[in-house]
Amino acid sequence: IWELKKDVYVVELDWYPDAPGEMVVLTCDTPEEDGITWTLDQSSEVLGSGKTLTIQVKEFGDAGQYTCHKGGEVLSHSLLLLHKKEDGIWSTDILKDQKEPKNKTFLRCEAKNYSGRFTCWWLTTISTDLTFSVKSSRGSSDPQGVTCGAATLSAERVRGDNKEYEYSVECQEDSACPAAEESLPIEVMVDAVHKLKYENYTSSFFIRDIIKPDPPKNLQLKPLKNSRQVEVSWEYPDTWSTPHSYFSLTFCVQVQGKSKREKKDRVFTDKTSATVICRKNASISVRAQDRYYSSSWSEWASVPCS
Amino acid sequence: RAVPGGSSPAWTQCQQLSQKLCTLAWSAHPLVGHMDLREEGDEETTNDVPHIQCGDGCDPQGLRDNSQFCLQRIHQGLIFYEKLLGSDIFTGEPSLLPDSPVGQLHASLLGLSQLLQPEGHHWETQQIPSLSPSQPWQRLLLRFKILRSLQAFVAVAARVFAHGAATLSP
């Protein structure tokens, strides 16, 4: 058993049929010695008396808010949560496996630049009695500070018969060094509590590996005289690191109709302009990627050919 | 070239060669990007490689003030990785595929280090740790980790030379 926060404790249980469970001793936070009784949740049934209460925690029915009273007055609470371990593996029932970029990916994180600011998100089908708490650091043995905000519900989607809820959190490295080569990864830890179930999820990454620039901005077209060709120009996204002579991007320019199966014109460039062939009912799209490190491409920025 | 007197390197040449290094480092093992090698107990391996750190003057301001500190750090790293790529980690079993770009990568690391340091001038170089894994699978894992680390190192070096070529070239 360990303390998650004040008056909230996590009991780690090996979860299998007829498991013996864990013996837990609760102590009432009071100077009083006599006349103390214990109850669980809303029940008035007295579970025991005395300053300490010893219980065998085996299942969710044994978890909950234990309260010690004296003469009708509440003295203190202890909330017990369960953390299940099945076949040596901690349960992951609360969050959905996003399966990208690999199986058992529960947390996904992205950064728009090298400033040390990043966003992580996760998915669940649970809509109520759900809380998250996020901590992060650079490195684990001698951790350097990363400050995370509160996790918030950022999107709701309908997936078949189920509703899916996306939560996200923004974090900022306290002393970021955008130009340096990272040697220690960022660690992100998410505590998830659903009713009386506790789970924790972690992710470890370098900012450079989670970079995904915003799409290029201000796409403009200039038809070339006596030609089917069009000069398309764009700018670096505002959110990208500066100076651009140091933090350079490379671009992919594509002309395509509405369907992905349609024919296309495609060209790669390090410049902020390119010449392509525009077709009626097609769009010109441009996306960006770090020029020197193969992290994710941005989403496309598009303008219609006409 | 970065010479003892502290004159400028051939920024544009360094830029071209460092960009080539980036391409080669990724083609040497593109799938490295999809392997979570941190799960495999990194500390004893890649913590020994030289990293371009915050105080090394490789940021735009540091380069403007005095690029020599940064260039020396990059040179150290190039020599370090060049030696690693020539060591039995890469030459031993399992043999690299004949079409592996590691050979080109090795030659390009040497080429860029020579651009930075001409004959007769020697910056101190970092000692290569004795990383001699006994098992072929350990060697394979070590290669992945070294290449992964090299990808990050050459990316910073390429940024430095691109910025130098754009803003510091005479």
Epitope: R228, Q229, T250, V255, R261, E262, K263, K264, D265, R266, V267, F268, T269, D270, T275, I277, R279, K280 | S27
Partner: antibody, heavy 118, light 107 residues
């Protein structure tokens, strides 16, 4: 599968014109760009231009501008390349090729030998 | 127009050996570079597109790398059917241009 079958060899006199055909099969004709590339005997490859069968748009290499015309007939899924004012250095194998991507050549015809000789 | 230069013009290699073919562009073309193989009396066939992407059905011994102005086609272990002429082609800008070719012959 995608296939391009070209017309047979031609012998022409200098100053004449030649029209080479290229019949496509195995795909929707308007879904691919069509290019023409030529190769003089013992020489390298030379791009001549492209046509979009969907709308008839064309782009020709400056070297051939004014001397070449590329057309298509969607009813027969056939592309044509006409080269006028032939000279002896136009002697070459002329290839048509098709791709969904505009700028490189995935599927090639077998080639048509055009000999220009007086 | 962009001039593509291939080297060497002829490469003599023994079967089973590695062949490295070079292609240089007269200006930076990012990764807009494609490789073709042509055997005598046949049309060329696409091997590699956008510098390093392998065409489906092409043996894994063919690989491409490079960006900017310098590109390489590597054939790791030459088989008898690989002796042919290899062309690079740039697609950075029109007109599309080819290199002069590298003939890979049996040593």
């Amino acid at each position: 599968q995608v296939q391009l079958v070209q017309s047979g060899a031609e012998v022409k006199k200098p100053g004449a014109s030649v029209k080479v055909s290229c019949k496509a099969s195995g795909y929707a004709f308007t879904d691919y760009y069509l290019h023409w590339v030529r190769q003089a005997p013992g020489r390298g490859l030379e791009w001549m231009g492209w046509i979009d069968p969907e709308n008839g748009d064309t782009e020709y290499a400056p070297k051939f501008q004014g001397r070449v015309t590329m057309t298509t007939d969607t009813s027969t899924s056939t592309a044509y390349m006409e080269l006028r004012s032939l000279r002896s250095d136009d002697t070459a194998v002329y290839y048509c090729n098709a791709n969904k991507e505009l700028r490189y050549f995935d599927v090639w015809g077998q080639g048509t030998m055009v000999t220009v000789s007086s | 127009e962009i001039v593509m230069t291939q080297s060497p013009a002829t490469l003599s290699v023994s079967p089973g050996e590695r062949a490295t073919l070079s292609c240089r562009a007269s200006q930076s073309i990012s990764i807009n570079l494609h490789w073709y193989q042509q055997k005598p009396g046949q049309a060329p066939r696409l091997l590699i597109y956008f510098a390093s992407q392998s065409t489906s059905g092409i043996p894994a011994r063919f690989s491409g790398s490079g960006s900017g102005t310098e590109f390489t086609l590597t054939i790791s272990s030459l088989q008898s059917e690989d002796f042919a002429v290899y062309y690079c082609q740039q697609s950075n800008s029109f007109p599309l241009t080819f290199g002069g070719g590298t003939k890979v012959e049996i040593k």
